[in-house]
């Protein structure tokens, strides 16, 4: 028995009561030492919780009158009073006492942090930490094993395990996300260390496998067939190829490339949006030269960490057969342009030269030719150009012609080439005076005096420089009043051969001059120089003669 510390009159045993009892439980008696048993003392309970207990007013016996729940209230602190009914007064001061509620295992373990979700990389090794789950048991941890929990895996073998005492979930077998990407694990928590009578609770853990790059991309087809028109320009996309990768996200990003293309005609670029390989024409193709190509393409992942390279040793490859499609192409001239030569003066129908165009296509269509640019030429179906008129180099030394070739099988197929015709010079023009000469001689001219310096021109082209020869015509020997001297530099000087002239008697002299060129054969012209006598006064200067309105005649002829 215990006595109240403050007042030695109260006596009781420690009070305990089992929780969750349906029957009335009497827990013990309160007694005052002053109570002599004459039934004059009355016992009373006061305080919070007094409603859960009753006391026998005469005997002081305390009983639990309600079912108690330790997890709700584990201690009841009550006050007791004893009254002497004979005097109607408390014989003791109020005393506090405690009723402790004893635990029974009436609570199962509970997981309070639900939902449990975890992410772990696929192919993680055994023992990899996934997540820790924790269950709580409301029972008294100090009473037996009521709150001692053991964890156990109800669902999740053989991929996962749980540490019994910690609730730590670990990987127990490698998992491949590409086979299964989500796992539902059920963990059971049991109290009483799993002994008979244990209560249990479960929780579900959702475990997602994150992707690692453990799959290389693989072509969907071992052979792709594509076509390209021979008229396709470089840079043309001629088709797509595609690989698949079981990984996701960045791990599925791939790059396509050419592994083998001896012709170096194609390229492959990657469309990173669609993850397709686009086959591009790098060089123009020609059906007549090569009408099919084979290339080998490969595909690799864009991002591969060093430790995962073992999954990517051999890149997947595919073969691409590319068929060139024939296009009816226009004719092709053998030369980009032609320079033909013909001497001037040739008769109508003279062959100038031949141009040639061919059909680059396999069917080799015959050609028809048309010529524009001059009416001096024509062309036949063999591409032979002939003259339709006699050509004069001095009228035109070059002709710029355009020859058009069309395929007889398809007149829409047309090509053109420039033909430049150079007309060669022949010596068909005699030299002549280079200008019109207005020649005067003074009446008082002296013998040997210079009357005129003459020069010549020749409309012909000269391979070397022209050389002209000047002579006084033999027909004109009776005219001895003037003399001609060839300067040997394509000029000649006319000198007075006498002293004094008479304007009234002989106002005009006609001097016949022969001019020859150095062509083969040489050509000579006969030219008449008209020399007018002029009254120059004392000055002996002919400059004023032209202003005197003298009548003169000048002529020349060519032989």
């Amino acid at each position: 028995d215990y006595k109240d510390d403050d007042d030695k009159a109260w006596v009781w045993r420690p009070f305990v009561v089992l929780e969750e009892m349906d029957d009335i439980q009497c827990v013990g008696k309160l007694r005052s030492d002053l109570d002599n048993g004459n039934n004059s003392f009355q016992y009373k309970l006061l305080g919070i919780g007094a409603g859960s207990f009753s006391i026998n007013e005469r005997t002081g016996e305390i009983c639990a009158i309600q079912k108690l729940d330790r997890e709700e209230k584990s201690l009841y602190i009550l006050r007791a009073q004893v009254i002497d009914t004979t005097i109607g007064k408390a014989v003791e001061t109020e005393s506090e006492f405690v009723i402790r509620v004893l635990d029974i295992n009436d609570n199962e373990p509970r997981f309070l942090d639900e939902p449990y979700e975890a992410i772990v990389p696929e192919m993680s090794p055994e023992g990899t930490f996934v997540i820790k789950v924790t269950a709580n048991d409301a029972d008294d941890p100090s009473t037996g094993y009521h709150a001692r929990i053991l964890y156990n895996l109800e669902r999740g073998q053989p991929y996962f395990s749980v540490e019994p005492t910690t609730g730590v979930i670990r990987i127990s077998s490698k998992m491949d996300r590409e086979l299964q990407d989500t796992y539902c694990v059920i963990i059971q928590a049991k109290d009483m260390l799993g002994q008979p009578g244990a209560l249990s609770g479960t929780t579900t853990v959702s475990i997602k496998l994150s992707d690692i790059n453990d799959n290389k991309p693989i072509f969907k087809e071992s052979l792709y067939r594509l076509t390209v028109s021979e008229s396709a320009p470089t840079g043309t996309s001629i088709g797509t190829i595609m690989a698949y990768d079981n990984d996701i996200g960045e791990n599925a990003e791939m790059d396509y490339s050419i592994e083998e293309d001896d012709s170096q005609t194609f390229d492959i670029i990657t469309n990173h949006e669609t993850q397709e390989g686009i086959v591009i024409l790098k060089k123009k193709v020609d059906f007549e030269h090569q009408n099919h190509y084979g290339i080998r393409a490969k595909v690799k992942n864009h991002h591969v960490p060093e430790q995962l390279m073992k999954y990517h040793t051999e890149a997947s490859t595919t073969f691409i057969k590319i068929q060139v499609e024939d296009v009816d192409e226009p004719p092709v001239f053998l030369l980009p342009y032609y320079i033909l030569e013909i001497p001037e003066g040739k008769p109508y129908g003279t062959i100038v030269g031949t141009v040639s165009a061919t059909d680059p296509d396999r069917r080799q269509s015959p050609m028809r030719y048309y010529l524009t640019g001059s009416k001096m030429f024509d062309i036949n179906d063999n591409g032979t150009i002939i003259t339709t008129n006699m050509l004069d180099r001095e009228v035109s030394a070059w002709y710029n012609l355009t020859v058009t070739a069309t395929e007889t099988y398809n007149v829409q197929q047309i090509s053109s080439a420039h033909v430049y015709v150079q007309v060669f010079n022949i010596n068909d023009n005699a030299p002549e005076f280079s200008q019109f000469y207005e020649t005067y001689v003074c009446e008082n001219a002296e013998s040997g005096e210079i009357v005129q310096i003459i020069s010549a021109i020749d409309r012909d082209e000269s391979i070397e420089d022209h050389h002209f020869y000047f002579n006084h015509s033999l027909e004109d020997t009776n005219n001895s009043s003037f003399m001609l001297t060839d300067n040997q530099d394509n000029t000649a000087v006319i000198l007075s051969n006498r002293t004094g002239f008479n304007l009234k008697e002989e106002p005009v002299f006609y001097m016949i001059i022969l001019i020859a060129d150095n062509g083969i054969p040489s050509l000579t012209s006969t030219n008449t120089l008209t020399i007018q006598v002029c009254d120059c006064g004392d000055s002996r200067n002919t400059e004023t003669c032209a202003n005197k309105g003298l009548l003169f005649i000048m002529g020349f002829r060519t032989e």
């Epitope: 071992s222 052979l223 001896d262 030269h289 009408n291």
Partner: antibody, heavy 119, light 107 residues
Framework: QVQLVESGGGVVQPGRSLRLSCAAS????????MHWVRQAPGKGLEWVAV????????YYADSVKGRFTISRDTSKNTLYLQMNSLRAEDTAVYYC????????????WGQGTLVSVSS | EIVLTQSPGTLSLSPGERATLSCRAS???????LAWYHQRPGQAPRLLIY???SRATGIPDRFSGSGSGTDFALTISSLEPEDFAVYYC????????FGQGTKVEIK
């Protein structure tokens, strides 16, 4: 195993027509380009025509262009060669051949059928 | 078109001897697109070599192909009785053309 069997050959007069057939078995016919090749008596081989795996493209040797037509019926696994305006120089053993999947050479040939053009 | 010229026209050899057959193209054959066939009398041709040097399925290793561009060769390291036949080269770079053939006969 792969088998190609030609039929339809025979004697025909110049200017007339003939149709050759080639029955294919032992492989996925619709995946392969197919060819006709001929061999004049005592002479070498001459390529005649090709048809693509799906029948969309045909190409011919210049010597037969405009006269011969190659075709295929995937449902019957059969290749055909329609020969019109036949000439004496078309006389030959006609072989059908399968083009290699990863190449353009001919990996399987039929035993051939003889076409004889004479009056 | 690409013209293939085979030489020699006839090759007379004994079994066990080495045979070298030549095939020359009139223009370069792209990507080694050249094949070799042999044809026994009364039979269809049979593919021996493709891609100038790759042996076809089931072809013994005594057959080997070489060359590129315009000059190609087929070598039979040691002739077997069944190797005496007509051999054709074929280009498939531009359309398909065959050489005129080389006859390998028993000496």
């Amino acid at each position: 195993q792969v088998q190609l069997v030609e039929s339809g050959g025979g004697v025909v007069q110049p200017g007339r027509s003939l149709r050759l057939s080639c029955a294919a078995s032992g492989f996925t016919f619709s995946s392969y380009d197919m060819h006709w090749v001929r061999q004049a008596p005592g002479k070498g081989l001459e390529w005649v025509a090709v048809i693509s795996y799906d029948g969309t493209n045909e190409y011919y040797a210049d010597s037969v262009k405009g006269r011969f037509t190659i075709s295929r019926d995937t449902s019957k696994n059969t290749l055909y060669l329609q020969m019109n305006s036949l000439r004496a120089e078309d006389t030959a053993v006609y072989y059908c051949a399968r083009e290699r999947y990863f190449d353009w050479s001919f990996d399987y040939w039929g035993q051939g059928t003889l076409v004889s053009v004479s009056s | 078109e690409i013209v293939l010229t085979q030489s020699p026209g006839t090759l007379s050899l004994s079994p066990g001897e080495r045979a070298t057959l030549s095939c020359r193209a009139s223009q370069s054959v792209s990507n080694t697109y050249l094949a070799w066939y042999h044809q026994r009398p009364g039979q269809a041709p049979r593919l021996l070599i493709y891609g100038a040097s790759s042996r076809a399925t089931g072809i013994p290793d005594r057959f080997s192909g070489s060359g590129s561009g315009t000059d190609f060769a087929l070598t039979i390291s040691s002739l077997e009785p069944e190797d005496f036949a007509v051999y054709y080269c074929q280009q498939y770079s531009n359309s398909w053309t065959f050489g005129q053939g080389t006859k390998v006969e028993i000496k």
